[in-house]
């Protein structure tokens, strides 16, 4: 089948990379600079994506994919393969169409992207509030408060975090 | 592919009111402020306004305040302009397009524009 | 409103030559968050507008880079290295800092 296909259309033999030069007799043309063909048999180069402006090149464009892009320090990639380029805000803000706003009360965002999101309920768990969240930090729960209740063993909290390669004191 | 579609020409009578559809693909116009922008013949540009369709929340500039009224429906991706009591100072074509200050696409888009004439 | 000035208003170039269109606003287009929300359009004869540049220098895709865009506060520049033929048209600066939004009155570039 193969065969008889590629009897029948010459251009099925031209692999990606190529295009089918209809101008020269069907023989296969390497793609032209800043084009390439991801698929064997096609008639056409397809033109490489630039990344200019807030854009930047993750990959280059070669004969047989294309360029990929992503965003500058400042902008983080949106949509399908890096449609759009979105301003980083703070932590503790989100991006709103008047641009970046601090989180209301109640919620917070720990990433320089997204939305601000609800602090967790701990009551919803059964638990209690252990740490205050803020507008970069979620709450930190605790055990139930009958946990705490006298008798009870108390909670050691986590021991505060070293810098690597730093012994304690 | 993300593509704008205005509704087409009109002819009205001085007086008259109007309203223009600006309809989006690829995108959801509530994710946008979509703005509207007036081209007299041979004229320059003129900013009329933005509308966000999530809220309904608009900003006019002074000289449109009471001329321009911007609506949008995102149940249809269509943001509208409604022109009142026109002129031939409306006679134009009316653009839309979703600016924004702190998204950028890799392509920048414009509606096809839909030309107005005030005529008796 | 910021007022946007354009000159000049006509720039008649050779397919080639450079050519160079000054924007200045009333008031700087310097915003709070420290970005300048300057941008230049391109309306080629019988077309919609087109972006080419956003804040100030930053190239649209498909924008070749002939095209350069300058300048902070309330001077601002668009340079094209060497004109071509498919340049022609009026380009205009548009200001997205303040309300209203403002564009320039537009500088028309023809060929020689």
């Known amino acids: 089948f193969e065969r008889t296909r590629s009897l029948q259309d010459p251009c099925s033999n031209c692999p990606a990379g190529t295009f089918c030069d209809n101008n020269r007799n069907q023989i296969c043309s390497p793609c032209p600079p800043n084009s390439f063909s991801s698929a064997g048999g096609q008639r056409t180069c397809d033109i490489c994506r630039q990344c200019k402006g807030v854009f930047r090149t993750r990959k280059e464009c070669s004969s047989t994919s294309n360029a990929e892009c992503d965003c500058t320090p400042g902008f983080h990639c949106l949509g399908a393969g890096c449609s759009m380029c979105e301003q980083d805000c703070k932590q503790g803000q989100e991006l709103t169409k008047k641009g970046c706003k601090d989180c209301c009360f109640g919620t917070f965002n720990d990433q320089k992207r997204g939305i601000c999101r609800p602090w967790t309920n701990c009551s919803l768990d059964g638990k209690s509030v252990l740490v205050n969240g803020t507008k970069e930090r979620d709450v930190v729960c605790g055990p139930s408060p009958a946990d705490l209740s006298p008798g009870a063993s108390s909670v050691t909290p986590p021991a505060p975090a070293r810098e690597p390669g730093h012994s304690p004191q | 592919e993300v593509q704008l579609q205005q509704s087409g020409a009109e002819l009205v009578r001085p007086g008259a009111s109007v309203k223009l559809s600006c309809t989006a693909s690829g995108f959801n116009i509530k994710d946008y402020y979509m703005h509207w922008v007036k081209q007299r013949p041979e004229q320059g540009l003129e900013w009329i306004g933005r509308?966000?369709?999530?809220?309904?929340?608009?900003e006019y500039a002074p000289k449109f305040q009471g001329k321009a009224t911007m609506t949008a429906d995102t149940s249809s991706n269509t943001a509208y302009l409604q022109l009142s009591t026109l002129t031939s100072e409306d006679t134009a074509v009316y653009y839309c397009?979703?600016?924004?200050?702190?998204?950028?696409?890799?392509?920048?888009?414009w509606g096809t524009g839909t030309t107005v004439t005030v005529s008796s | 409103d910021v007022v946007m000035t354009q000159t000049p208003l006509t720039l008649s170039v050779t397919i080639g030559q450079a050519a160079s269109i000054s924007c200045k606003s009333s008031?700087?287009?310097?915003?709070?968050?420290?970005?300048?929300?300057l941008n230049w359009l391109l309306q080629r004869p019988g077309q919609s507008p087109k972006r080419l540049i956003y804040?100030?220098?930053k190239l649209d895709s498909g924008v070749p880079d002939r095209f350069t865009g300058s300048g902070s506060g309330t001077d601002f520049t668009l340079k094209i290295s060497r004109v071509e033929a498919e340049d022609l048209g009026v380009y205009y600066c548009w200001q997205g800092t303040h309300f209203p939004h403002t564009f320039g009155g537009g500088t028309k570039l023809e060929i020689k």
């Open positions: 509308i966000d369709p999530e809220d309904g929340d608009t």
């Open positions: 008031q700087s287009l310097l915003d709070s968050d420290g970005k300048t929300y």
């Open positions: 804040l100030v220098s």
């Open positions: 397009t979703p600016y924004s200050n702190y998204v950028y696409w890799y392509f920048d888009v």
